[in-house]
């Protein structure tokens, strides 16, 4: 199943910035999803639950974020990605066991000024 | 070495147009190679060498293209891809045998107005 | 190896207070909720109450709620109960257990508290 | 809260028997496809050791006579063929909401 993740829009605009979305299984209960600019981790988000089944949310990068029961939603600023640079979902998954490791969808990131004055977004199969 | 090919950047602007390459490995010598928009074929690409080794190169739908010794890059108007459609390239390798279809590096392109002036582009790791 | 160590238990008269602390090595403790179970001599087990990863979220079983608070420090690897307006109720051995994000993987040997005048 | 029952609340057995322990929750257990429901072994003068999670999946390390099974309410724990060193508590625990409770526990004993 966690090979058809990639089958999504990664990338979109929102609110003037980039939207990048990380997609994992509903199946995943716990989870920890990291989105890397090239080798740099610029977003962390752990989802956990206690013995009683209480939600606790980890975001120690302070990163915007939008969390669904399938897709974890990074919202960077335009200028985080303006040199040109290469983005990675990695989903860690504790629950269901086993514990995964997962590098799933990831691209090439890059807006620069033009005189078409248009977006174009590719977003990985 | 085929599946190192998604390694590229598959898309890129080029004279008010988009520029779609499509790599493939360099101990090739004749193929076919087919851009598909969705499932349909878009352009399709041969190249065969007769005899005296004289090389032949079929384009039955005319596209634009650039052969290299490991892509072939084909060059669309904007117009193409502006309601968002999802970009295949599949190679066919006639020689060296054995004969081999691969589907490689493919991506999802969206082309629309911003008021934001910029391009943004995203492609396959 | 995780090891969870708690240390603190001992008498303690009806209405005092006591801090227990377990001590916790061989995983990256900020990664985990920690809870507390405690038994009763000859008793079964009950939960007291749990902790999220960075002391946000705590929760405790109706027996303990307004009496016992639970803290962690990260820095030090360990985790605390505070154990306020004790009652003979309390008295039990405390284990410190690590959730495991599915179940108690991991618990100490436990502390004995006794409350008795 | 949700209570936990157990029965039976002790056992005489011997070696090689099949032992059966039931667990009953007062309500539904079951979320999203999964069983919040654990079980644990306790030997005496020990903290407890992590049998079962999700109802049936063993924990690492515990042997494959022990086998969880059950849905919803009803759960049970399994031992095809005991052994002496089995010897001890078992308890079945909740994590469906808060408070997780414990049932109270079956004692295993020689015969």
């Known amino acids: 199943e966690l090979n058809d993740l990639a089958n999504h829009r990664m990338f979109s605009f929102h609110d003037g910035g980039v939207q990048i979305s990380c997609n994992y299984p509903e199946t995943v209960q716990q989870l920890k999803m990291q989105l890397f600019k090239d080798r740099e981790v610029l977003c962390d988000l752990t989802k956990t639950k206690g013995s009683g089944n209480t939600v606790s949310i980890k975001n120690p990068m302070s990163c915007p974020y939008q969390l669904s029961n399938n897709s974890v939603s990074f919202f960077l600023d335009n200028a985080d990605s303006s040199q040109g640079s290469y983005f990675l979902c990695s989903l860690s998954i504790f629950d269901p066991p086993p514990f995964q490791e997962k590098n799933l969808s990831g691209g090439y990131l890059l807006i620069y000024e033009s005189q078409l004055c248009c977006q174009l977004k590719l977003w990985l199969p | 070495e085929l599946n190192d090919l998604a390694n590229h950047r598959m898309f890129s602007f080029h004279d008010g147009g988009v520029q779609i390459s499509c790599n493939y490995p360099e101990t090739v010598q004749q193929l076919k190679m087919q851009l598909f928009k969705d499932r349909e074929v878009l352009c399709d690409l041969t190249k065969t060498k007769g005899s005296g080794n004289t090389v032949s190169i079929k384009n039955p739908m005319s596209c634009p293209y650039q052969l290299s010794n490991n892509s072939v890059s084909f060059f669309l108007d904007n117009a193409d891809s502006s309601q968002g459609s999802y970009f295949l390239c599949s190679l066919s390798i006639f020689d060296p045998p054995p004969f081999q279809e691969k589907n490689l590096s493919g991506g999802y392109l969206l082309i629309y107005e911003s008021q934001l002036c910029c391009q943004l582009k995203l492609w396959l790791p | 190896e995780v090891q969870l160590v708690e240390s603190g238990g001992g008498l303690v008269k009806p209405g005092g207070s006591l801090k227990l602390s377990c001590a916790a090595s061989g995983f990256t403790f900020s990664d985990y909720w920690m809870d507390w179970v405690r038994q009763a001599p000859g008793k079964g087990l009950e939960w007291v109450g749990n902790?999220?990863?960075?002391?946000?979220?705590?929760n405790f079983a109706p027996s303990v709620k307004g009496r016992f608070t639970i803290s962690r420090d990260n820095a030090k690897n360990t985790l605390y109960l505070q154990m306020n307006s004790v009652k003979s109720e309390d008295t039990a051995t405390y284990y410190c257990a690590r959730w495991g994000h599915y179940a108690f993987d991991s618990w100490g040997q436990g502390t004995l508290v006794t409350v008795s005048s | 809260d949700i209570v936990m029952t157990q029965s039976p609340s002790s056992l005489a057995v011997s070696a090689g028997d099949k032992v059966t322990i039931n667990c009953k929750s007062s309500?539904?257990?079951?979320?999203?496809?999964?069983?919040?429901l654990i079980w644990y072994q306790q030997k005496t003068g020990q903290a407890p050791k992590l049998l079962i999670f999700?109802?049936?999946t063993r924990h690492t390390g515990v042997p494959d006579r022990f086998i969880g099974s059950g849905s919803g309410t009803d759960f049970t724990l399994t031992i095809t063929s005991f052994q002496t060193e089995d010897l001890g508590d078992y308890y079945c625990q909740h994590h469906y909401s808060s408070p997780p409770t414990f049932g109270p526990g079956t004692k295993l004993e020689i015969k």
């Open positions: 999700y109802a049936s």
């Open positions: 902790i999220d990863h960075d002391g946000n979220i705590i």
């Open positions: 309500q539904s257990l079951l979320s999203s496809g999964y069983n919040y």
